[in-house]
C-alpha cells in the first residue's frame, strides 16, 4: 500500500504552488467571484508570466471564454485585480490587439483566443477559481481517511452550477491504494 | 546605451515641495513595456521605491507616500518629473531614477541625487 | 522594518561560497511574484544583479545564482573575490503593500 499526498482537490489542477479550477458551467462575472469564495478560493490573479502562460494554454486548449479576476469596474479605464492590487505595467502585454476597448462598457476580463479581453461583466462565462496547494507534511496530520470506494472523479460537468465544485472539493486528500501484482 | 540622469535641488527646507527630473536615453517611454521609476536611500540605509509611470501613462505610488507624490512624464523630452510635497529631514536621501522593463526588474539606474532636508 | 527580510550582514573568505536569503511572505513572494536581485558597491548606484529568480543580465559572472522557493529567496556567490563586497538587496512586489518592494539589504564583507 502506498499513500499519496495530493495537494489539490480532485478536478483541481496543480501548478506552481497553487491549484486551480477550470469551470464546466457558465456565469456571470460577479457570480463567478461568489463560485471561487464558497469553496475557499478566489477568482484567478495572475501574479506571473509563467501563471500567465499556464492559464492562457488552458484557456484556448479548450477554446472557452474564461473569466478572470481582473476589472476596471470601479474606476473606468483603471483595471485591477479581485485581490484589490494593479493591473502591473507587465502584464498590459497580455491584452489582445486592440484591446482593452471598452466597446459598449466592457469592464470585466477574459481569456480569450491567445490573449485577454474586455467583455460584459453580466455575461456568462467559464470561470478560474485559485487557491494555495495544501501542505503535504505527515506532521500536520492532513491525510483524511481513505475516500468512498469510487474509482475515478465523477465525470467533468455533471454537476450543474457550483455542484461541480463541490462535489471536487469533498476529497482533498485520498489514500491510493497499489496492488502491485 | 541605456542611460539615466537626475536632476533636482540638493537642499530643500522643511514644509517645501521637492521637485526632481530624470532625463534619460537609449529608450523610450513611449514604447510599450517600458516604465520609469523613483526609488531613494536614505544615508546607510535601504532601498524604497517610491512612484513608477509607465508608457500608457499608468501611475504607481507607494501607499505610504501617496498623497505627497506626483509623477509625470514628458515623452518628446525623454524626462520623468517626480513631486514630493511637505518636505521633511526624514526625507533626506539619495533619490534614484531606474527603468523598469518586462518582468518588473528595474535593470537601468541613474547615479542618483542627494537631497538634503533641513532649515 | 523592511517587507522582504535580509540578514543584515554575511562574510567570506576569497575562493568561499556565501548565500544571503530573502524572506517575504504570501503578499509578495508567496503569491508568486518574482524576485530580482541588486549589488550597490560603495558609492555607486545599484546595479541589477539577477532578475526573475534565476537569471543573469548580460556581464554578470555565473558565480552569481538565485533561487527561488515558496516564500522566500536566495543569492548564491561562489569563489568569492574581494570586489564582490557590497550591499546585496533582493526585491518583490506586494500585493497587499500595492507596490514594490526591497528587502533590508545584506553588506557581503570578504574576509582577509
Known amino acids: 500500500t502506498e499513500r499519496l499526498c495530493h495537494p489539490c482537490p480532485w478536478e483541481w489542477t496543480f501548478f506552481q504552488g497553487n491549484c486551480y479550477f477550470m469551470s464546466n458551467s457558465q456565469r456571470n462575472w460577479h457570480d463567478s467571484i461568489t463560485a471561487c469564495k464558497e469553496v475557499g478560493a478566489q477568482l484567478v490573479v495572475i501574479k506571473s508570466a509563467e501563471e500567465q502562460n499556464f492559464l492562457q494554454l488552458q484557456s484556448s486548449r479548450s477554446n472557452r471564454f474564461t473569466w478572470m479576476g481582473l476589472s476596471d469596474l470601479n474606476q473606468e479605464g483603471t483595471w485591477q485585480w479581485v485581490d484589490g492590487s494593479p493591473l502591473l505595467p507587465s502584464f498590459k502585454q497580455y491584452w489582445n490587439r486592440g484591446e482593452p476597448n471598452n466597446v459598449g462598457e466592457e469592464d470585466c476580463a477574459e481569456f480569450s483566443g491567445n490573449g485577454w479581453n474586455d467583455d460584459k461583466c453580466n455575461l456568462a462565462k467559464f470561470w478560474i477559481c485559485k487557491k494555495s496547494a495544501a501542505s503535504c507534511s505527515r506532521d500536520e496530520e492532513q491525510f483524511l481517511s481513505p475516500a468512498p470506494a469510487t474509482p475515478n472523479p465523477p465525470p467533468a460537468g455533471s454537476g450543474g452550477g457550483l455542484n461541480d465544485i463541490f462535489e471536487a472539493q469533498k476529497i482533498e486528500w485520498h489514500e491510493h491504494h497499489h496492488h502491485h501484482h | 546605451q541605456v542611460t539615466l540622469r537626475e536632476s533636482g535641488p540638493a537642499l530643500v527646507k522643511p514644509t517645501q515641495t521637492l521637485t526632481l527630473t530624470c532625463t534619460f536615453s537609449?529608450?523610450?517611454?513611449?514604447?510599450?513595456?517600458?516604465?520609469v521609476s523613483w526609488i531613494r536611500q536614505p544615508p546607510g540605509k535601504a532601498l524604497e521605491w517610491l512612484a513608477l509611470?509607465?508608457?500608457?501613462?499608468?501611475?504607481y505610488y507607494s501607499t505610504s507616500l501617496k498623497t505627497r507624490l506626483t509623477i509625470s512624464k514628458d515623452t518628446s523630452k525623454n524626462q520623468v518629473v517626480l513631486t514630493m510635497t511637505n518636505m521633511d529631514p526624514v526625507d533626506t536621501a539619495t533619490y534614484y531614477c531606474?527603468?523598469?522593463?518586462?518582468?518588473?526588474?528595474?535593470?537601468?539606474w541613474g547615479q542618483g541625487t542627494m537631497v538634503t532636508v533641513s532649515s | 522594518q523592511s517587507v522582504l527580510t535580509q540578514p543584515p550582514s554575511v562574510s567570506g573568505a576569497p575562493g568561499q561560497r556565501v548565500t544571503i536569503s530573502c524572506t517575504g511572505s504570501?503578499?509578495?513572494?508567496?503569491?508568486?511574484?518574482?524576485v530580482h536581485w541588486y549589488q550597490q558597491l560603495p558609492g555607486t548606484a545599484p546595479k541589477l544583479l539577477i532578475y526573475?529568480?534565476?537569471n543573469r543580465p548580460s556581464g554578470v559572472p555565473d558565480r552569481f545564482s538565485g533561487s527561488k522557493s515558496g516564500t522566500s529567496a536566495s543569492l548564491a556567490i561562489t569563489g568569492l573575490q574581494a570586489e564582490d563586497e557590497a550591499d546585496y538587496y533582493c526585491?518583490?512586489?506586494?500585493?497587499?503593500?500595492?507596490?514594490?518592494?526591497f528587502g533590508g539589504g545584506t553588506k557581503l564583507t570578504v574576509l582577509g
Open positions: 526573475v529568480n534565476s
Open positions: 537609449g529608450f523610450s517611454l513611449s514604447t510599450s513595456g517600458m516604465s
Open positions: 504570501s503578499s509578495n513572494i508567496g503569491a508568486g511574484y518574482d
Open positions: 531606474a527603468r523598469m522593463a518586462l518582468r518588473h526588474a528595474f535593470d537601468a
Open positions: 509611470i509607465d508608457w500608457d501613462d499608468d501611475k
Open positions: 526585491q518583490s512586489y506586494d500585493s497587499s503593500l500595492s507596490g514594490w518592494v
